[in-house]
């Protein structure tokens, strides 16, 4: 398990932009955290290339990643979330090039879920409901949701509604009748801690009554 | 798999320096943390320092100004020099692995003794 | 430094028989860990981050606490699990062991 490389592959490694992103998951496995870190030009090699954090930690000074094919990784519950970690690009012992980031500035939350859309006939409204991990945790608990919706014929004519609970109520006469829709959300940290866009959650498809047709509940299709 | 074997003298006249050495196999040292660890009857475990994978070392204050750990990564080895020893720094000495979790990979470990 | 101080010192139990030993920390510390020794060998991991137990370790085995506070529990004695057992704490430096727990069959 040598981290070496030939003194030919140092130089040309040194050639190659080996800008890198990373994010962090609070939580994300009962008590564990993780931080998924990955280049930004997919064509980089890493054959001989390492990512290890060193600071702010609790317990060790320094961890390095798992490799699990493009991306490399780290699953574990010793983050401090206080102060800035050193994030570095290795060969061997020689670091390329590193990035100081605070772990609590770059969360993305897990994609939210149990997606539906429940039709109020007397209301004449439309009740969307899901549910998020982040109610239960810790850390990560206050998030803002960005709900989209677009009827299915149009491709990218998406409507987006950001809010901060997990129910929306869509008003019938906003919508198209007898229109087949499409609907799925997705969060971002909202209070203290920073970040990213979580994945979006599966799709929900509705289908709008007819006007003067009494529905009750909309069935997913 | 993952082992790691200390070497060194087994005995050393009082005042002189212990060095010792940790060979590993099965883990690539520049990604992973080795910390020296003694054992003697009177004094238990005590935890002598570490060195980290980026090369930075932190010493037991105990001993830190007699104590040096390196590393030559290319032969897979970790390095211990403690200068002026004397007789209660007899011991068994072990390196391990500071893993992610604990000391989670030690050494056999190697006897040395004080004395003239 | 953080003083780990564990009792009993030395313990005799019989088969089938709970056990418990105690670590207690001069100062708050994040996580305890647990080696077990056996006399002419190294220590082995065996309870990690306070509770997690090693990989092989039987799950009659526990550990518990937070704090200053912390224990390794056998839920029922084997013959096997007599040895020294010793608490560690890498929350601040220099990190300490615990003065031992031997363990003897009854």
């Known amino acids: 398990e040598s981290g070496y490389a030939q003194n030919g592959d140092l130089e040309d490694a040194e050639l190659d932009d080996y800008s890198f992103s990373c994010y962090s998951q609070l939580e994300v496995n009962g008590s564990q955290h993780s931080l998924t870190c990955a280049f930004e030009d997919p064509d980089v090699n890493i054959t001989n290339l390492e990512f290890e954090i060193c600071g702010a930690l609790v317990e060790v000074k320094c961890l390095n990643f798992r490799k699990l094919q493009e991306i490399y990784f780290i699953e574990t519950k010793k983050f401090l979330l206080i102060g800035k970690s050193n994030i570095c690009v290795k060969v061997g012992e020689k670091s390329l090039t590193c990035k100081k980031i605070d772990l609590t500035t770059i969360v993305k939350p897990e994609a939210p879920f149990d997606l539906s859309v429940v039709y109020r006939e007397g209301a004449n409204d439309f009740v969307v409901t899901f549910n998020t991990s982040h109610l239960q945790k810790k850390y990560v608990k206050v998030l803002m949701h960005d709900v989209a919706y677009r009827q299915e014929k149009d491709e990218n004519k998406w409507t987006h509604v950001n809010l901060s609970s997990t129910k929306l109520t869509l008003l019938q006469r906003k919508l198209q009748p007898a229109a087949m829709y499409e609907i799925k959300v997705r969060s971002i940290p909202d209070h203290y801690f920073k970040g990213f866009w979580s994945e979006w959650s599966p799709s929900y498809y509705f289908r709008t009554p007819e006007i003067n047709n009494s529905s009750g509940e909309m069935d997913p299709i | 798999q993952v082992q790691l074997k200390e070497s060194g003298p087994g005995l050393v006249q009082p005042s002189q320096t212990l060095s010792l050495t940790c060979t590993v196999s099965g883990l690539s040292l520049p990604n992973n943390n080795i910390a020296w660890i003694r054992q003697s009857p009177g004094k238990g475990l005590e935890w002598m320092g570490v060195i980290w994978s980026n090369g930075d070392t932190d010493y037991n204050s105990a001993i830190r100004s007699r104590l040096s750990i390196s590393r030559d990564s290319s032969k897979s080895q970790v390095f211990l020099r403690m200068n002026s020893l004397q007789s209660e720094d007899t011991a068994m000495y072990f390196c391990?692995?500071?893993?992610?979790?604990?000391?989670?990979?030690w050494g056999q470990g190697v006897v040395v003794t004080v004395s003239s | 430094e953080i003083v780990l101080t564990q009792s009993p010192t030395t313990m005799a139990a019989s088969p089938g028989e709970k056990v418990t030993i105690t670590c207690r920390a001069s100062?708050?510390?994040?996580?305890m860990h647990w080696f077990q020794q056996k006399s002419g060998s190294s220590p082995k991991p065996w309870i990690y981050?306070?509770?997690d137990l090693a990989s092989g370790v039987p799950d009659r085995f526990s550990g518990s606490g937070s704090g200053t506070s912390y224990s390794l529990t056998i839920s029922s004695m084997e013959a096997e699990d007599a040895a020294t057992y010793y608490c560690l704490q890498r929350s601040s430096y220099p990190r300490t062991f615990g003065g031992g727990t031997k363990l003897e069959l009854k």
């Open positions: 981050d306070s509770s």
């Open positions: 100062s708050s510390v994040s996580y």
């Open positions: 391990a692995r500071e893993g992610m979790t604990t000391l989670d990979y």
